[in-house]
């Protein structure tokens, strides 16, 4: 069992990774926050059955403050929520208008987290002199995952404990009492 994806014990409740709910409609329609991973391009010819890698799903960007006990992150973090339906979809006849419309059929495809990153955040805490930091595990990208009848919800939950792959590059290093700088939750087998 996992660290509960670096469990957020905050007042801002964040579902465990791999268990994000469908975003509310107002988020879905917020074009400034959404981007289709395939750039909005249709996946080749609509009648072709492509590999799942040809399809993608929407990544909703949102920001939040990380909290831990009475502490709050100095800056908000940007996170993704994986949303929307995945292909392969087939153009099926629309009985009403004789037109074509997208409708998923066959195996179930889900939009789920693909990669994670761990981000260090500096916490601002009331009282207490020592700066505190924590690392939060954030969804870095989403992908379409084919779920057969044998891979139901339990498969989705596996992604919550998938090893994180944090972004490369150095982050700011605020710390306390160090010569180098100015300032400074997996399940526990009980």
């Amino acid at each position: 069992q996992g660290w509960q994806a670096f469990k957020n014990d905050a007042t801002e409740i964040i579902p465990e990774l791999g268990e994000y709910p469908e975003p509310p409609p107002e988020l879905e329609n917020n074009k400034t926050m959404n981007r289709a991973e395939n750039g909005g391009r249709p996946p080749h010819h609509p009648f072709e059955t492509k590999d799942v890698s040809e399809y993608s799903c929407r990544e909703l960007h949102f920001t939040r403050y990380v909290t831990d006990g009475p502490c709050r992150s100095a800056k908000p973090v940007t996170e993704l929520v994986c949303s929307g339906q995945c292909g392969p979809a087939r153009l099926l006849p629309n009985a009403i208008g004789r037109g074509k419309w997208w409708r998923p059929s066959g195996p179930d495809f889900r939009c789920i987290p693909d990669r994670y990153r761990a981000q260090r955040v500096q916490l601002l805490c009331p009282g207490g002199e020592a700066p505190r930091a924590r690392k939060v595990r954030l969804v870095a990208s989403c992908k379409c995952k084919r779920l057969t009848r044998f891979h139901n919800q339990s498969e989705l939950k596996d992604f919550g404990t998938e090893a994180a792959r944090p972004q490369k590059g150095r982050k700011p290093r605020p710390r306390a009492r160090s010569a180098k700088a100015n300032q400074a939750e997996l399940e526990n087998a009980y």
Partner: antibody, heavy 118, light 107 residues
Framework: QVQLVQSGAEVKKPGASVKVSCKVS????????QHWVRQAPGKGLEWMGW????????EYASKFQGRVTMTEDTSTDTAYMELSSLRSEDTAVYYC???????????WGQGTTVTVSS | DIQMTQSPSSLSASVGDRVTITCRAS??????LNWYQQKPGKAPKLLIY???TRWTGVPSRFSGSGSGTDFTLTISSLQPEDFATYYC?????????FGGGTKVEIK
């Protein structure tokens, strides 16, 4: 499951150095903070410091400043703690611990006994 | 350094008893306090953090309370596996420091 496996017991002479390793599995070490805590025979726990493997950041207890060095090899998910200028009072069990914060120790290694004796 | 004083240093109790361990800080540490359990020859395990939040998987019979300088760890109904030594740890200011421990023994 997160597991921390430490290197074996060491016997050192006063003035020598010791380097204890801690292999982390179940999570990439750079996604965590690594802590070191020691416990002298029959005594309580003593925090030595923490490090951030991703950026090489460290915070050492002032008592150990200048004698302790905490490093990591992120390619092997292994943390190291080196203590120099050993004296008899450094005889203790040394624990590595890991967590998502700089202030709590979520998971612990099994401990490494270091004996300093002439 | 902030001194953490635990009392009692040891206590004897029976299975089913309610046990209370106290931890006092030498200065105000708000609720920046953790509790750990350690069994002989084993590494400690995190029980409580932020003074009162149970760590994942810790049974509900363990509870923490307090703020400022005085804190308590309570085991509502002592179980055979609870006989161990318990440590508090402050993280209000560096260096993080532990209490001297409270050993809970079988009566």
């Amino acid at each position: 499951q997160v597991q921390l496996v430490q290197s074996g017991a060491e016997v050192k002479k006063p003035g020598a150095s010791v380097k204890v390793s801690c292999k982390v599995s179940g999570f990439p070490i750079k996604d965590t903070f690594q802590h070191w805590v020691r416990q002298a025979p029959g005594k309580g726990l003593e925090w030595m410091g923490w490090s951030d493997p991703e950026i090489g950041d460290t915070e050492y207890a002032s008592k150990f400043q200048g004698r302790v060095t905490m490093t990591e090899d992120t390619s092997t998910d292994t943390a190291y703690m080196e203590l120099s200028s050993l004296r008899s009072e450094d005889t203790a069990v040394y624990y590595c611990a890991t967590g998502d914060t700089t202030y709590k120790f979520d998971f612990w290694g099994q401990g490494t006994t270091v004996t300093v004796s002439s | 350094d902030i001194q953490m004083t635990q009392s009692p240093s040891s206590l004897s109790a029976s299975v089913g008893d309610r046990v209370t361990i106290t931890c006092r800080a030498s200065q105000d540490i708000s609720n920046y306090l953790n509790w750990y359990q350690q069994k002989p020859g084993k590494a400690p395990k995190l029980l409580i953090y932020w003074a009162s939040t149970r760590w994942t998987g810790v049974p509900s019979r363990f509870s923490g309370s307090g703020s400022g300088t005085d804190f308590t760890l309570t085991i509502s109904s002592l179980q055979p596996e609870d006989f161990a030594t318990y440590y508090c740890q402050q993280y209000s200011d560096y260096p993080w420091t532990f209490g001297g421990g409270t050993k809970v023994e079988i009566k």
